[in-house]
């Protein structure tokens, strides 16, 4: 299983941009217009246009509410007036440069309309959305607009019992056959068009792929077995002349396999799919997100597939056929017989045209009848390397987007951004046959499921957008700037981040226009490439005899083990003298003069069979008797951001050029106030930094009082 994320960013720790409108929910349809830098958001009863670079900036809004009459009729059918009998936007697709095609559940009477992007008003077409959009907001759906025609997968009736994959077209509308071998209680996940290259030698057609999970027809168990499927139709399909009239003649489906070769663990419920297109990729790669059917332990997996493998299955694979055993029991077996020519389900290519099959309308009946009877392939689509890219325990992933990026050394990484049902986003890469989860970001404070993920691919403007029930969040692809040291930057093993020695900052490569010369990045995590730290920094503290000291160690890595050294000896945190707070900060009880000295917080992290040791913090502690006037016994204390309680903080300057600025000041009433401007602090948020290689114990002291002191 994949390790835990190396770093966890809490919602408050990182800069996230949010969009939500009062009383508007279910922000589940997202559409990005890269050229306009606009993100379109389809929610319940509303569509918004926001600035894609800063989604908190709303540009336009339009509401599409359900009339009271419609609501009442819907409620009469036993549906909830407050939730179900509303208009959930389910289709948000580009129709032209100036309009969007929008469909909503419309109180169980699905409707579609055109949204004019100039006026941001609906044209009032009120088209019947049956077959394009579900009746029930709880039912699955997917759609893709291809050359002005909407291809959708959804349910065709009020009950949601009739599944359909259709093309909404004025000249050639097509749909699936309503038959169990074609679609058996599918849960639609994703659809996309795969264009054939114009110089394709076989004059091939564009294909539209559909991804769904359905009830298996080929496997028999006591319970209903779910199977993930990839299906495809040809864009040029016009249906059959007699057989399969106004039905797909090119609909074929195959099983998607995502399992570990060495275990019986099968991931058979498809959650989401992302098609990765990249200039370096001849054939697109699609990433699919799965969970097992019986998922009581919270398992999720990601498998990657070459589209060429899927196409090979459809073009040359064997078919499955059904046979009725006994009265109503159907068994599925491999069809070994001669397959009609032209091949059933094949797109019309130059070879077919040469044989005078210029359109699906003049395909021979035997070919059409065969594909009608055999929509299911016997061959399965297997993942790249025959194994999942990622398997994670104790998490339910919901959505995936993938970005292909190049590290400084030229290595190409597919960065997986995977959202969870608790509002988090994981960023993961494959590193030498292992998975590295770079970070976890809490996108939504309320831990609500992420319903939609979208990736912007515009150079220099790289964001992930996440939609949930309560709103949309915009996050950058990386939080490089949060890595305060070269070691942190390198150990992050984030292909987007590199250390810039001149500025002593961790920078995002996709934001740097300048050449990458001089930047430090080591995807192996070898921090020895970092420039030598000629100066060591330490924090100097003064504590009262008999009190308790808390020494901070802000190590963000969840993969690191923190330990403390005192006068070069490792401290045992379990002893009565010491304790660990939050697995990192050191507590020293019952302070005495013998506790004075240098304390070092070190982290130990396994990186690629190597153990990396890092000095995270150095503290110089001196235990003395505190003069009485410093603190009144009734001192009321407040907690500073660094969880340290202080009455006076002085920042020691080695140059001594300017007087120290107090970070926390004691007022006459004994309350503590923060200054208007924060004092520069180290990565561990400690207010006192002394920069020197040798501790100077006689420099100005900073006095700290813990609440357990002087009582």
């Amino acid at each position: 299983f994949a390790p835990i994320p190396r770093i966890t960013w809490e919602h408050r720790e990182v800069r996230l941009v949010q969009f939500h409108e009062p009383d508007i929910y279910n922000y589940s349809a997202l559409l990005l217009s890269e050229d306009k830098d606009t993100l379109y958001i389809g929610a319940r009863e509303a569509v918004f246009a926001v600035n894609a670079l800063n989604i908190s900036e709303k540009q336009h809004e339009v509401y599409w509410k359900v009339s009271e009459d419609k609501k009442a009729k819907c409620a009469e059918k036993g549906k909830s007036k407050q939730t179900e009998c509303l208009n959930y936007i389910r289709v948000l697709q580009p129709l032209s440069a100036t309009s969007l095609y929008v469909c909503g559940t419309n109180a169980f009477q699905p409707a579609c309309d055109h949204l004019n992007l100039t006026s941001f008003k609906f044209l009032g077409k009120n088209e019947d959305g049956k077959g394009r959009c579900p009746f029930d907001p709880a039912h699955s759906y997917t759609s893709v607009m291809v050359d002005g025609e909407l291809y959708s997968g959804t349910s065709y009736n009020f009950l949601g019992s009739e599944p359909i994959i259709s093309r909404n077209s004025s000249h050639s509308p097509l749909r699936t056959e309503y038959a169990i071998p074609w679609l058996n209680e599918p849960s639609f996940v994703f659809a996309d068009v795969i264009r054939k290259s114009p110089d394709s030698p076989d004059g091939e057609d564009d294909r539209v792929y559909f991804f769904f999970t359905e009830v298996s027809v080929e496997y028999e168990f006591v319970f209903r077995v779910l199977i993930p499927r990839i299906a495809r139709v040809c864009k040029g399909d016009q249906g059959g002349l007699r057989t399969l009239q106004k039905k797909w003649t090119s609909f074929l489906k195959a099983r998607l396999i995502c399992s570990r070769p060495d275990s019986s663990l099968v991931f058979n419920v498809l959650r989401d799919v992302f098609v990765l297109r990249s200039p370096g990729l001849k054939v697109p790669v699609f990433y699919a997100l799965f969970t097992p059917q019986l998922n009581n332990v919270g398992l999720s997996a990601v498998c990657a597939y070459n589209l060429s493998i899927a196409e090979e299955v459809f073009s040359h694979g064997k078919y499955m056929q059904s046979a009725t055993v006994e009265q109503s029991h159907t068994k599925w077996v491999r069809y070994n017989g001669p397959v009609p020519k032209p091949r059933p389900g094949a797109c019309i290519d130059s070879e077919a045209r040469a044989a005078n099959y210029t359109s699906s309308l003049n395909l021979p009946d035997k070919t059409l009848q065969f594909v009608k009877d055999h929509p299911l392939m016997d061959d399965s689509v297997t993942p790249i390397d025959n194994r999942p890219r990622l398997i994670k325990k104790d998490v339910n992933y919901t959505q995936i987007v993938v970005d292909r990026t190049q590290a400084l050394d030229g290595t190409v990484y597919d960065v997986m951004f995977v959202s969870t049902d608790r509002g988090a986003l994981h960023k993961a890469i494959s590193l030498e046959h292992a998975v590295h989860i770079i970070e976890e970001t809490q996108l939504f404070q309320d831990f609500e499921p992420v319903q939609t993920l979208l990736l912007s691919s515009k150079k220099g403007r790289r964001f992930v957008y996440a939609g949930s029930n309560s709103g949309v969040v915009q996050a950058p692809l990386a939080f490089c700037g949060k890595h305060g040291t070269c070691e942190d930057c390198v150990l992050a093993r984030d292909p987007y981040c590199a250390w810039s020695p001149p500025t002593a900052t961790c920078v995002a490569l996709y934001q740097t226009e300048s050449p990458s010369r001089g930047l430090v990045q080591e995807m192996s995590g070898d921090a020895s490439v970092c420039p030598d730290k000629s100066k060591g920094s330490y924090r100097q503290h003064f504590f009262k005899h008999g009190g308790t000291a808390e020494l901070k160690c802000s190590q963000k890595s969840n993969l690191a083990r923190v330990f403390w050294k005192f006068q070069n000896g490792v401290l045992k945190a379990e002893s009565p003298k010491y304790g660990l707070m939050g697995r990192k900060n050191l507590l020293i009880f019952n302070l005495s003069e013998g506790d004075s000295g240098v304390y070092q917080c070190l982290s130990e992290e396994r990186v690629k069979n190597k153990t990396v040791f890092q000095v995270v913090a150095k503290h110089v502690l001196e235990v003395k008797v505190v003069p009485k006037p410093v603190v009144a016994p009734t001192l009321s204390v407040v907690q500073t951001e660094g969880s340290r309680i202080a009455t006076k903080v002085l920042v020691a300057s080695t140059q001594g050029s300017s007087p120290p600025t107090p970070a926390v000041q004691a007022t006459s009433s004994g309350a503590i106030t923060l200054p208007p401007k924060p004092v520069p602090t180290s990565t561990s948020c400690e207010p006192k930094i002394v920069i020197n290689t040798v501790p100077q114990l006689h420099s100005e002291k900073t006095m700290y009082l813990k609440s357990s002191d002087n009582r």
């Epitope: 059904s322 046979a323 009725t324 055993v325 077996v333 017989g337 397959v339 020519k341 035997k366 070919t367």
Partner: antibody, heavy 117, light 106 residues
Framework: EVQLQQSGAELVRPGASVKLSCTAS????????IHWVKQRPEQGLEWIGW????????EYASNFQAKATITADTSSNTAYLQLSSLTSEDTAVYYC??????????WGQGTLVTVST | QIVLTQSPAIMSASPGEKVTISCSAR?????MYWYQQKPGSSPKPWIY???NLASGVPARFSGSGSGTSYSLTISSMEAEDAATYYC?????????FGGGTKLEIK
């Protein structure tokens, strides 16, 4: 007009081999499948196997696996059936036929093979 | 292999009479195919995929069935229908034929 023209009758000795031909006209054999079917005197029909001349893929009925060899030559639009180690049990009329999901649609006139000393 | 059993093996019918020939499969098949053969001739395709009449077959013929039970029916027997009829499946290897039903005219 679609036609399958089969080679003439054969009288062969036991233990010998024979190669029957089936030449197609009116269509290209690459666009179809050629099957061979055996019919012993006054008996029923037995399927021997088929070939896809487009790619040379062949399937045999298990009881003809050692007996029959099906080949095709697309340049002459001809399919062949070779029978080896002949015995009196192999005395029969052998038909070539085209067939796929519509069944065996076109049949040759048949070739009588007599195995006798 | 799937064994097909035809019944009856031999039957005779008067002109105008309705005739039904049955074909039973030991295990289920998707479709049944029927062929007509007259003495000294090659078999002719008669019914394909259970119920579709081959080109040139008179409309008095029909085919039906599913699973393991199939039949060929002549609504009104005519003299030219006297022949041997074979059923055949295309389901799994080997593609077997029934033993044949010899239909004679009374």
């Amino acid at each position: 007009e679609v036609q399958l023209q089969q080679s003439g009758a054969e009288l062969v000795r036991p233990g010998a081999s024979v190669k029957l031909s089936c030449t197609a006209s009116g269509f290209n054999i690459k666009d179809d499948y050629i099957h061979w079917v055996k019919q012993r005197p006054e008996q029923g029909l037995e399927w021997i196997g088929w070939i896809d001349p487009a790619n040379g893929h062949i399937e045999y009925a298990s009881n003809f696996q050692a007996k029959a060899t099906i080949t095709a030559d697309t340049s002459s639009n001809t399919a062949y059936l070779q029978l080896s180690s002949l015995t009196s049990e192999d005395t029969a009329v052998y038909y070539c036929t085209t067939g796929d999901y519509d069944g065996f649609t076109y049949w040759g006139q048949g070739t009588l093979v007599t195995v006798s000393t | 292999q799937i064994v097909l059993t035809q019944s009856p093996a031999i039957m005779s019918a008067s002109p105008g009479e309705k005739v039904t020939i049955s074909c039973s499969a030991r295990s289920s098949v998707s479709y049944m195919y029927w062929y007509q053969q007259k003495p000294g001739s090659s078999p002719k395709p008669w019914i394909y995929r259970t119920s579709n009449l081959a080109s040139g077959v008179p409309a008095r013929f029909s085919g039906s069935g599913s699973g393991t039970s199939y039949s060929l029916t002549i609504s009104s027997m005519e003299a030219e229908d006297a022949a041997t009829y074979y059923c055949q499946h295309y389901h799994t290897y080997p593609y077997t034929f029934g033993g044949g039903t010899k239909l004679e005219i009374k």
